[in-house]
Interface confidence: low
């Protein structure tokens, strides 16, 4: 997001600068990779807290014995294949942090937008070259949310093999062209999640169970766009076994009409779909097959929009999704920037999460709270944020439940163990678990009736238009109900 | 160490040219677009012009388009700013400052070196 | 041209206590989940040097008593506690898009 919520409970320090990345040392005295304590339960049946509770009990009785030698960190392995390479040449790779016992293998694709032209992409060139080269990445990464190896702050799958492949490709992961005299900048989104499968299949990833490929932002929209690729590669290369699922955070969007329209100067204030337009054209963007198969030719950007794909997709993907997001507002230029909204905007916004809402009523596996915010997986707060008392964690282990029971012939959700997790709140902010929201000046924490006065909400009016005393209103979003 | 040390800097009168230099050491120069900026005499900061790491976008603020020139040569790691048809208001001091390619933002400044412009 | 609106332009604060300085965009200076806004710090005969980048990150070797937020139009540089050293003049700048501009600055005084 833009600054105006922390992902922290009160006390904690501010979470380090999320640019430019810092080199972090690997643990003294570690000769090698640390190997994660080799337990796996693709599906746990039964209470998921009294599990959590043993599985917490287990890592605190064992940490004593291997304080000296835990490492967090994802460490740094550039691709063998240099061909296959970032925006400006340099080779592109990814950071791996194996779990020698275990049979699951998460690949995370970062995010960061995209560019379409010469121009703009020359812009993020200059400043955010990290996105577009391998030149300046740090040795290693701290894995954290659904990459930390800690079972506190990763309940659902502590255990796995974490890779984090980063964004350096400013395609959305769609590009497949190689260098030519016409164009500066080479775009290999696809190729480069194609050849990093390719090479940890060397370490690894051969005896996997299951691989979900997760992403946040335009890498939650890059899991929409290959996922199906990947199950097809493995397929191909001989290992039909290995379960291929996806999870996209932040990167379902839509082609809504724009708060206000702008012309397509940059990258953020263009229209979505127009960007994607040129886009296509400008990285030679690969889409799944099926999905362009329904789009006539120079329609082919239809699919880069989560509910026009997700139809056509064959693994099973989960959909985490804000319903206000931030992106898409910003997308819209309707974003809020602090300053009081007009009723339209309002009016505009309330619409978004309703028009959200329902491109996800046929998606069974989803979670969406009614927050402002981007990007939830990889926060170390992700399991905060609950829908219907439910929290993502606890709908991801859900969802592993529901594909390890689909053999059976039974297609109703599993007894208090839901995965279709939406708001109906209608509301930013009326989820009372939503991140933080607090004044930019002051710094202090505001509750939801707090910020939807200080945006400008006007609560007589909407009172008003509810039918509802001022005062309950204010009660209601108070609680969150 | 990281350093930028601009040198050119005289009296000239107003019509005049002069040309001002920034020697940069310490760190790999064609990695990074660079600026000129100046500060007049109890004066704000004001931006002058702007040259991307490998001299393919240049830049300049509306008042000196047309007056001032910059270029810069990798090789021997120099950022020059070329300054025509001065004028009184031109005078200030003027630093040339690294910009980081992570934001944007200035992370390196030289110490800047003294125009004068006056009849 | 955005045009950044700073103030106060001058500010007396005791010694120990909060210094804030705010810094108006008059259009926003965010895009893609980050913010294009600086603080920089300039004492009498020395260039300007570099507080805070992207609005809240702290340029390594500053003191932590310094911090920014804000986001959008609207950012903020907090200095707390304030010591005799930090009397002089601060700048914000944005580089969302060329041409960058600066505020016009504030000058603190400690009494």
């Known amino acids: 997001g833009e600054g105006r919520k922390t992902w922290r409970r009160r006390g904690q320090q501010p979470a380090p600068a999320p640019l430019p990345p810092q080199r972090t040392e690997a643990a003294p005295g570690t000769g090698q990779p640390v190997e994660s304590f080799p337990l796996d339960f693709t599906a746990v049946e039964g209470n998921m807290d009294s599990f959590m509770a043993q599985v917490k009990s287990l890592a605190q009785s064992l940490y004593p014995c291997s304080a000296q030698q835990l490492n967090e960190d994802l460490r740094l392995h550039l691709l063998l294949n240099t061909s296959v390479t970032c925006n400006d040449g340099s080779p592109a790779g990814y950071y791996l942090k194996e779990s020698k016992g275990s049979r699951r293998w998460l690949l995370f694709l970062e995010g960061g937008w995209y560019c379409f032209s010469r121009e703009n992409c020359d812009s993020r060139y200059d400043t955010m070259r990290r996105l577009m080269s391998s030149k300046d990445w740090p040795q290693t990464r701290t894995g954290t949310g659904i990459l930390s190896s800690q079972p506190e702050e990763n309940p659902y799958w502590w255990n796995a093999n974490m890779v984090f492949i980063p964004y350096c490709s400013s395609d959305v992961w769609s590009g497949a062209s190689s260098k030519s005299e016409k164009n500066e900048y080479v775009f290999m989104g696809a190729l480069i999640i194609r050849e990093v499968v390719q090479e940890l299949l060397g370490r690894g990833l051969s005896g996997a169970k299951v691989l979900l490929l997760a992403g946040s932002s335009a890498g939650g929209t890059g899991v929409l766009l290959n996922v199906d690729r990947v199950a097809e590669q493995l397929e191909q290369l001989g290992y039909p076994a290995i379960q291929v699922r996806g999870l996209a955070d932040s990167g379902w969007f839509l082609d809504n009409k724009q708060y206000r329209r702008t012309d397509c100067v940059d990258t953020v204030t263009c229209a979505p779909t127009e960007a994607i337009r040129r886009g296509i054209r400008y990285w030679n963007g690969m889409v799944p097959e099926r999905c362009r198969s329904q789009f006539k030719e120079g329609e082919e950007w239809n699919c880069f929009l989560g509910y026009k794909v997700y139809p056509t997709l064959r693994c099973p993907v989960f959909v985490v999704q804000w319903l206000f997001d931030e992106a898409q507002l910003t997308a819209d230029n309707a974003h809020l920037t602090g300053q009081p909204v007009q009723e339209g905007q309002w009016l505009y916004i309330q619409n978004l999460g309703h028009e959200l809402r329902n491109t996800l009523k046929d998606v069974p596996a989803s979670f969406a709270p009614a927050c402002l915010s981007h990007e939830i997986i990889i926060r170390s707060h992700w399991t905060d944020v609950q829908v219907k008392g439910t929290s993502l964690p606890r709908a991801l282990h859900c969802w592993d439940r529901s594909l390890h029971d689909s053999h059976k012939a039974s297609k109703t959700p599993l007894k208090g163990c839901p995965i279709h997790l939406v708001d109906s709140c209608p509301w930013p902010h009326c989820n009372p678990s939503c991140p933080t929201i607090r004044d930019q000046f002051t710094g202090q924490e505001m509750n939801v009736a707090q910020f939807l006065m200080h945006m400008g909400f006007d609560v007589q009016t909407v009172a008003q238009q509810q039918g509802l005393e001022p005062s309950k209103l204010l009660g209601m979003l108070s609680s969150g109900s | 160490e990281v350093q930028l040390v601009e040198s050119g800097g005289d009296l000239v009168k107003p019509g005049g040219s002069l040309k001002l230099s920034c020697a940069a050491s310490g760190f790999t120069f064609s990695d990074y677009g660079m600026h000129w900026l100046r500060q007049a005499p109890e004066k704000g900061l004001e931006w002058v012009a702007y040259?991307?790491?490998?001299?393919?976008?240049?830049s300049y603020a509306n008042t000196m388009k047309g007056r001032f020139t910059i270029s810069r040569d990798n090789a021997k790691k120099t950022l020059s700013l070329q300054m025509t048809s001065l004028r009184s208001e031109d005078t200030a001091i003027y630093y040339c400052?690294?910009?980081?390619?992570?934001?944007?933002?200035?992370?390196?400044w030289g110490t800047g070196t003294t125009v004068t412009v006056s009849s | 041209d955005i045009v950044l609106t700073q103030s106060p332009a001058s500010l007396v604060v005791s010694l120990g206590q909060r210094a804030t300085i705010s810094c108006r965009a008059s259009?926003?200076?965010?895009?893609?989940?980050?913010?294009?806004m600086h603080w920089y710090q300039q004492k009498p005969g020395q260039p300007p040097k570099l507080l805070i980048y992207l609005a809240s990150n702290l340029e390594s070797g500053v003191p932590a008593r310094f911090s920014g937020s804000g986001s959008g139009t609207d950012f903020t540089l907090n200095i707390h506690p304030v010591e005799e050293g930090d009397a002089t003049t601060y700048y914000c700048q944005h580089s969302r898009v060329l041409p960058p501009t600066f505020g016009s600055g504030t000058k603190l005084e400690i009494k």
């Open positions: 400052a690294r910009k980081n390619y992570n934001g944007g933002y200035f992370d390196v």
């Open positions: 040259i991307s790491s490998g001299s393919t976008t240049l």
């Open positions: 259009k926003s200076v965010s895009e893609s989940g980050y913010s294009y």
